[in-house]
């Protein structure tokens, strides 16, 4: 029921989460937690932003994107098998029961002997579109799927870029990432 993302032991994992700020710099508090989103909060918080900045983080967890533009995707550095599990991204939109809640499943695989990333795996991880139904309680948070949204020309370009070990950063900076607001 939640979107699944994969990474290998020793790599950085990327869990996408986006919103569209009402105006540049008009930020919304966001929290990331380990565990499924509870009714009001974020579970065991690993990172938190307020209306201005990242105001709490723990080691290995950081925002690599431009959170001031609503890219609050979480990067987990040098993952281990213990990092597997459900993560909660909660966009704490002001108002009555306006929160956006996303449960994302991270699956950590043992490191491969020959680290040759496949197009499909990295492509999906870098270009997710999260389709969600909205609800006010944990049971009503449901993620419906992860769909790539990119054309064939871009796939051709990406095939070359996939050889680059900086894939996640390059793809995210390419401007093709989908945002939800």
């Amino acid at each position: 029921s939640e979107v699944e993302y994969r990474a290998e032991v020793g790599q950085n994992a990327y869990l996408p989460c986006f919103y569209t700020p009402a105006a540049p710099g008009n930020l919304v508090p966001v929290c990331w937690g380990k565990g499924a989103c509870p009714v009001f909060e974020c579970g065991n918080v690993v990172l938190r932003t307020d209306e201005r900045d990242v105001n709490y983080w723990t080691s290995r967890y950081w925002l690599n994107g431009d959170f001031r533009k609503g890219d609050v995707s979480l990067t987990i550095e040098n993952v281990t098998l213990a990092d597997s599990g459900i993560y909660c991204c909660r966009i704490q939109i002001p108002g009555i029961m306006n929160d956006e809640k996303f449960n994302l499943k991270l699956v950590i695989k043992p490191a491969k002997v020959t680290p040759a990333p496949t197009l499909q795996r990295d492509f999906t991880a870098a270009f997710p579109r999260m389709l969600t139904t909205r609800g006010h309680g944990p049971a009503e948070t449901q993620t419906l799927g992860s769909l790539p949204d990119i054309n064939l020309t871009q796939i051709s370009t990406l095939a070359n870029e996939l050889r680059d070990s900086r894939l996640a950063n390059d793809l995210r900076d390419s401007g093709a990432t989908i945002r939800i607001g």
Partner: antibody
């Protein structure tokens, strides 16, 4: 030591307004969801409002549009503004701290303040 | 709304015996493997006190004679052996969905 102290209760006429305050101390207030829970004389407990650490608001249908909850993280105070009061709002009102990381249940409660709505 | 039905409404027990209070939810309160059900104790003139969270976790400082069990829609609070200090009202509460809801309470009395 975690402490929650409610104030502002009293006697109000139907249709009137009142603002309750909850002064918190002994913990990092801004990190916690805060709730108001009321208890009618028959001892039943009813959750009436919550505000998350990020400022999102939650209410049951019974008070939606009449009550609002707010917080002042600089002063460590949570408020419950109650408008269009009715006789069935008469109750003991407790301020409660939501458990860290969850918020949906309550590990500390104040002693309560009494609201009586009567003409 | 999730309706919580507590039974019995009152329970008379002898000191040293076991007291069992039940709480049934109108729908499941299971969420990613956790049962989002709590139990509180309330003595006259005092606010409620958290005893058990997530169905079976005993809150810090709560005596080991209190235990919780159950999953899905059916939950129980057990007190064994009952002591005089346990005479109070007991409430269940779900944190699965807004609105948060409580059971009507069970009054524990001495036989």
């Amino acid at each position: 030591e975690v402490k929650l102290v409610e104030s502002g209760g009293g006697l109000v006429k139907p249709g009137g307004s009142l603002k309750l305050s909850c002064a918190a101390s002994g913990f990092t207030f801004s990190r916690y969801a805060m709730s108001w829970v009321r208890q009618i004389p028959e001892k039943r407990l009813e959750w009436v409002a919550a505000i998350s650490s990020g400022g999102s608001l939650y209410f049951p249908d019974s008070v939606k549009g009449r009550f609002t909850i707010s917080r002042d993280n600089a002063r460590n105070i949570c408020y419950l503004q109650m408008n269009s009061l009715r006789s069935d709002d008469t109750a003991m009102y407790y301020c409660a701290r939501g458990r860290e990381a969850d918020g949906g249940y309550f590990d500390y409660w104040g002693q309560g303040t009494t609201l009586t709505v009567s003409s | 709304d999730i309706v919580l039905t507590q039974s019995p409404a009152s329970l008379a027990v002898s000191l040293g015996q076991r007291a069992t209070i039940s709480c049934r939810a109108s729908e499941s309160v299971e969420y990613y493997g956790t049962s989002l059900m709590q139990w509180y104790q309330q003595k006259p003139g005092q606010p409620p006190k958290l005893l058990i969270y997530a169905a079976s976790n005993v809150e810090s400082g709560v005596p080991a004679r209190f235990s919780g069990s159950g999953s899905g829609t059916d939950f129980s609070l057990n007190i064994h052996p009952v002591e005089e200090d346990d005479i109070a009202m007991y409430f269940c509460q779900q944190s699965m969905k807004v609105p948060l809801t409580f059971g009507a309470g069970t009054k524990l009395e001495l036989k």
